[in-house]
């Protein structure tokens, strides 16, 4: 797996560097996992062809995974900086399950896998870090995750393959979008 | 490959309004990532980004024109559409669009296209 | 806005010279600065992007440094083509603003 943010040789080389701020390092920790993700995505791809499938093809998925759109806040239209960090976190969260179902779906990039699901609760709590109103955050029901996990895992392999490349897909497009809106913050 | 190419009138009138079109290739905006963006550069003078659209449909504008710019795009025909409302002539420039594509969305322009100049005058 | 503050406006150069092209924004960007050489009656062209990454097709005699709120474009041995001018960019957050640019021209 990949040096942590802040671990890299060039940090370690140039230690008269200012210590990153809250921002930077919001920012780095997103890269990293984005890092992460296009990694476990070469492996799905080169395992199987879904990522040639269409998007409309792949849309017609029952799985509901966390999307930014224009009422979030996020988006430069109607921009609300606390509405989008609770956006963010909240699709954080509820990514979780997601990845917790990847941790099982590959091979050599093993440990990559459990590198991105760490490396986002490390994102999470430094974003509940910035947010004013916590109480806004909905966490979601364990209960409801582990029925959809265990469901997640009876499907046959080909719709395991497809939900593998699908949340990976979605999780890539809902960092970048974060990643944009955090950088206006 | 990637190209680029800008349309549009070459001479517009005060206050009338300006469509480019941006017809491109070799890449889709529906690609997360992914935006296309105007800038434009008067005689002799230095470049000045206009606007972005990204492949969620996110827009954002350069504030000083942002009442008189509108982008849109449509990704089954591969085209960004500029509009730009009150032309006057201190706005006769040549106009490029370009794009950005990148995971970390660094924002860098790596292709561009060949320009459209457009003269206001009336 | 993030202010892109360019030095020297002009550059005086002799093929084979090493020169320094500078750029400083009005506040922290990271690494998210990026290169243009925009050539006399040509688009402008990404030389380099991120402060240093290089890009495909570009020479290697082109280098970027630098890092926060000041960077360097670097040409280690200046090529008569290499006359134009040379604009910086803020990629961090928007908008999105350029310097005014360096101007790159032979003794």
């Known amino acids: 797996a990949p040096v942590p943010p802040g671990e890299d040789s060039k940090d370690v080389a140039a230690p008269h560097r200012q210590p990153l701020t809250s921002s930077e390092r919001i920012d780095k920790q997103i890269r990293y996992i984005l890092d992460g993700i296009s990694a476990l995505r070469k492996e799905t791809c080169n395992k199987s062809n879904m990522c040639e499938s269409s998007k409309e093809a792949l849309a017609e998925n029952n799985l509901n995974l966390p999307k930014m759109a224009e009422k979030d806040g996020c988006f430069q239209s109607g921009f609300n900086e606390e509405t989008c960090l609770v956006k963010i976190i909240t699709g954080l969260l509820e990514f979780e399950v997601y990845l917790e179902y990847l941790q099982n779906r590959f091979e050599s990039s093993e440990e990559q896998a459990r590198a991105v699901q760490m490396s986002t609760k490390v994102l999470i709590q430094f974003l509940q870090k910035k947010a004013k109103n916590l109480d806004a955050i909905t966490t979601p029901d364990p209960t409801t995750n582990a029925s959809l996990l265990t469901k997640l895992q009876a499907q046959n392999q080909w719709l395991q393959d497809m939900t593998t490349h699908l949340i990976l897909r979605s999780f890539k497009e809902f960092l970048q979008s974060s990643l944009r809106a955090l950088r206006q913050m | 490959q990637v190209t680029l190419k800008e349309s549009g009138p070459t001479l517009v009138k005060p206050t009338q309004t300006l469509t480019l079109t941006c017809t491109f290739s070799g890449f889709s905006l529906s690609t997360s990532g992914v935006a296309v963006g105007w800038i434009r550069q008067p005689p002799g003078k230095a470049l000045e980004w206009l606007a972005l659209?990204?492949?969620?449909?996110?827009?954002h504008y350069s504030p000083s024109l942002k009442s008189r710019l509108t982008i849109t795009k449509d990704t089954s025909k591969n085209q960004v559409v500029l509009t730009m409302t009150n032309m006057d002539p201190v706005d006769t420039a040549t106009y490029y669009c370009?794009?950005?594509?990148?995971?970390?969305?660094?924002?860098?322009?790596?292709?561009w296209g060949q320009g459209t100049l457009v003269t206001v005058s009336s | 806005d993030i202010v892109m503050t360019q030095s020297p406006a002009t550059l005086s150069v002799t093929p084979g010279d090493r020169v320094s092209l500078s750029c400083r924004a009005s506040?922290?960007?990271?690494?998210?600065l990026h290169w243009y050489q925009q050539k006399s009656h040509e688009s402008p062209r990404l030389l380099i992007k991120?402060?240093?990454q290089s890009i495909s097709g570009i020479p290697s005699r082109f280098s970027g440094s630098g890092s926060g709120s000041d960077f360097t474009l670097s040409i280690n041995s200046v090529e008569p083509e290499d006359v134009g001018v040379y604009y910086c960019q803020n990629g961090h957050s928007f908008p999105l603003t350029f310097g005014a640019g360096t101007k790159l021209e032979l003794k």
């Open positions: 506040q922290s960007i990271s690494d998210y």
């Open positions: 370009a794009r950005s594509y990148d995971d970390y969305l660094y924002y860098a322009l790596d292709y």
């Open positions: 991120s402060v240093s």
């Open positions: 659209i990204f492949w969620d449909d996110d827009k």
